[in-house]
Interface confidence: medium
């Protein structure tokens, strides 16, 4: 079976992974919901050029995932 990652992350998910610890560090009292809200606002206010690295990484991960599935499907026959 494909050695697929647990989740295919979006550009926004990758952005959140990077900035969530920073927000928590700066605002330790914020609830999970408030952190998510702040991350959403930050993403919406991020310029298209600055979003590009995250979008590129997400596209690369999607490509890898598709290759994993393709490699699995090329393996052979039913049991």
């Amino acid at each position: 079976d494909p050695n697929a990652p647990k989740r295919l992350p979006s550009a926004f998910f990758l952005f959140c992974s990077e900035y969530r610890p920073k927000i928590k560090g700066e605002h330790p009292g914020l609830s999970i919901g408030d952190v998510a809200k702040k991350l959403g606002e930050m993403w919406n206010n991020t310029a298209a050029d600055d979003k590009q690295p995250y979008e590129k990484k997400a596209a690369k991960l999607k490509e890898k995932y598709e290759k994993d599935i393709a490699a699995y499907r090329a393996k052979g026959k039913p049991d």
């Epitope: 079976d1 990652p5 647990k6 599935i69 393709a70 699995y72």
Partner: antibody, heavy 117, light 109 residues
């Protein structure tokens, strides 16, 4: 013996919701990609959605994207299809199918979903 | 409209040979395996041919599959009354997506 048993079909009004289940037995469910395929009356087979063994990766046909959600519970050996904002064109027999290497080697007997007012 | 193109119907007399075509593109059949299913309405589809030309155990050798470029075909020789059914070709695209043909109704005259 491999068995796939769908349930949850029925009559629902346009705009309504249904949740289909597929109980799997006779194989190690958690190791296989699983899919939903449907056949509308008088039409051909149409792939609806697929999900990888971990459950973390899913894909949908354009016709159901944003309305249907596929999921699985490997501890219960069960595949699900949550169908929201149902339309008349979603009326079909829905089959769950086990994939191995790109083909479906086992299918359930299907459950009928009728969307009508 | 289906991603793979099949004739809606074919017919032949018992003991004759019949072929069902399936046409696709480089994104599916051209680069990926083709599978054929036999389908009796109201029943579960049955895997007939996989990996273009392989037969699962239990499928008679009267059934055979072939592929060339972006097209595939299913051949049935020594046609029998019980072969009257719907036949579907299937391949796949990128990721998890799967594509089917529109299906071909086989009538045994």
């Amino acid at each position: 013996e491999v068995q796939l048993l769908e349930s949850g079909g029925g009559l629902v009004q346009p705009g309504g919701s249904l949740r289909l289940s597929c109980a799997a037995s006779g194989f190690t469910f958690s190791k296989y990609i699983m899919h939903w395929v449907r056949q509308a009356p008088g039409k051909g087979l149409e792939w609806v959605s697929g999900i990888v063994p971990s459950g973390g990766l899913t894909e949908y046909a354009d016709s159901v994207k944003g309305r249907f959600t596929i999921s699985r519970d490997n501890s219960k050996n069960t595949l699900y299809l949550q169908m929201n904002s149902l339309r008349a064109e979603d009326t079909a027999t829905y089959y769950c199918a086990k994939e191995i290497f790109g083909q479906f080697d086992y299918w359930g007997q299907g459950t009928l979903v009728t969307v009508s007012s | 409209q289906s991603a793979l193109t099949q004739p809606p119907s074919v017919s032949a007399a018992p003991r004759q040979r019949v072929t069902i075509s399936c046409s696709g593109s480089t994104s599916n059949i051209g680069n990926n395996a083709v599978t054929w299913y036999q389908y009796f309405p109201g029943k579960a589809p049955k895997l007939l041919i996989y990996s273009d030309n392989q037969r699962p155990s239990g499928v008679p050798d009267r059934f055979s599959g072939s592929k060339s470029g972006t097209s595939a075909s299913l051949a049935i020789t020594g046609l029998q009354a019980e072969d009257e059914a719907d036949y579907y070709c299937q391949s796949y695209d990128r990721g998890l997506s799967v594509v089917f043909g529109g299906g071909t109704k086989l009538t045994v005259l």
